[in-house]
Amino acid sequence: VPRWRQQWSGPGTTKRFPETVLARCVKYTEIHPEMRHVDCQSVWDAFKGAFISKHPCNITEEDYQPLMKLGTQTVPCNKILLWSRIKDLAHQFTQVQRDMFTLEDTLLGYLADDLTWCGEFNTSKINYQSCPDWRKDCSNNPVSVFWKTVSRRFAEAACDVVHVMLNGSRSKIFDKNSTFGSVEVHNLQPEKVQTLEAWVIHGGREDSRDLCQDPTIKELESIISKRNIQFSCKNIYRPDKFLQCVKNPEDSSCTSEI
């Protein structure tokens, strides 16, 4: 008799999830000499241990602590780039500006990027059929709790000027409900961080509006100022040109405002 299985509203675990996590870990530790000491089998065991045999709506940050410990990594605290709803451009930027880091440039972020996973209460099986959706099912699911945990730690580590890339094409350029708005903003440490610098990325070719005056940006400024951190904002009118000038600031096309 087939065992009854909970049907969740979200997509199931990414196929070949264990193999993908293990392969990514091996690749990352080969590329990053400072992480060569990491035992990827232990990393996978700790990752698995965070959600296997547990109810996928009852996951806690505590469940991920063994994984957090194994994945401990020091990135330059003044070279952190946060992002919200504009992941691809943020990653393109750090691929060029190699000394800056998004969360997905760290081991733990790299392992989990774009993946979904969950288990089932009291069985050692991974659920490839469905996983809880944050809105429709529950917020304390394995994926959401993972990203909340690593995002909090990443923000806590930041210092000096922290940069955040925001999507100027969205109706809410700053969204209080995003990971940036609900976790990272509130975990920047005022005793270490002097300024949060927002880069608002324009989507339209001819969009010359000052999106730093957007009401949601003003809301972000207010939240940050109340936390005793300064705030600054810059419009990036031409993201393609911005990336080009990061690659080569001496390029002749970089002699005007970006």
């Epitope: 003044n78 070279k79 800056m100 000096d160 000027v161 940069h163 002097q194 300024t195 610098e197 927002a198 880069w199 300064q230 600054s232 904002c233 810059k234 000038c245 990061v246 600031p249 970089c254 002699t255 005007s256 405002e257 970006i258």
Partner: nanobody, 122 residues
């Protein structure tokens, strides 16, 4: 290339004020982070303050509340307003530039001025 020229350094009494200027030419000034460093007699060059292309400011702990960095993109100039000066602020003050992002490490700045001497003494 970015050319930088500092000015404004002079002899000043303890407790006094001074405003240093750094005029830039050669590239689009507004795309560059600008910083002030200083080198006292027999000391290493040390970070004082920086301002990014987006106007984010960054200060060394020893100048917080006394010094203010600002920029005027229309004039291609960065300023360092120095108040409540102390004898230990005596140094050659250098202006530096790098693409976009404000950081503390001198090695990360590509362009440097020749420096301007500030002496705090009674």
């Amino acid at each position: 290339q970015v050319q930088l020229q500092e000015s404004g350094g002079r002899l000043v009494q303890p407790g006094g004020s001074l405003r240093l200027s750094c005029a830039a030419s050669g590239r689009t000034f507004s795309n560059y982070a600008m910083a002030w460093f200083r080198q006292g007699p027999g000391k290493e060059r040390e970070f004082v303050a920086a301002i990014s292309a987006a106007d984010s400011t960054l200060y060394a702990d020893f100048v917080k509340g006394r010094f203010t960095i600002s920029r005027d993109n229309a004039k291609n100039t960065v300023y360092l307003q120095m108040n409540s000066l102390k004898p230990e602020d005596t140094a050659v003050y250098y202006c530096a530039a790098r693409w976009w992002i404000a950081v503390r490490a001198p090695a990360e700045y590509n362009y440097w001025g020749q420096g301007t001497q500030v002496t705090v003494s009674s």
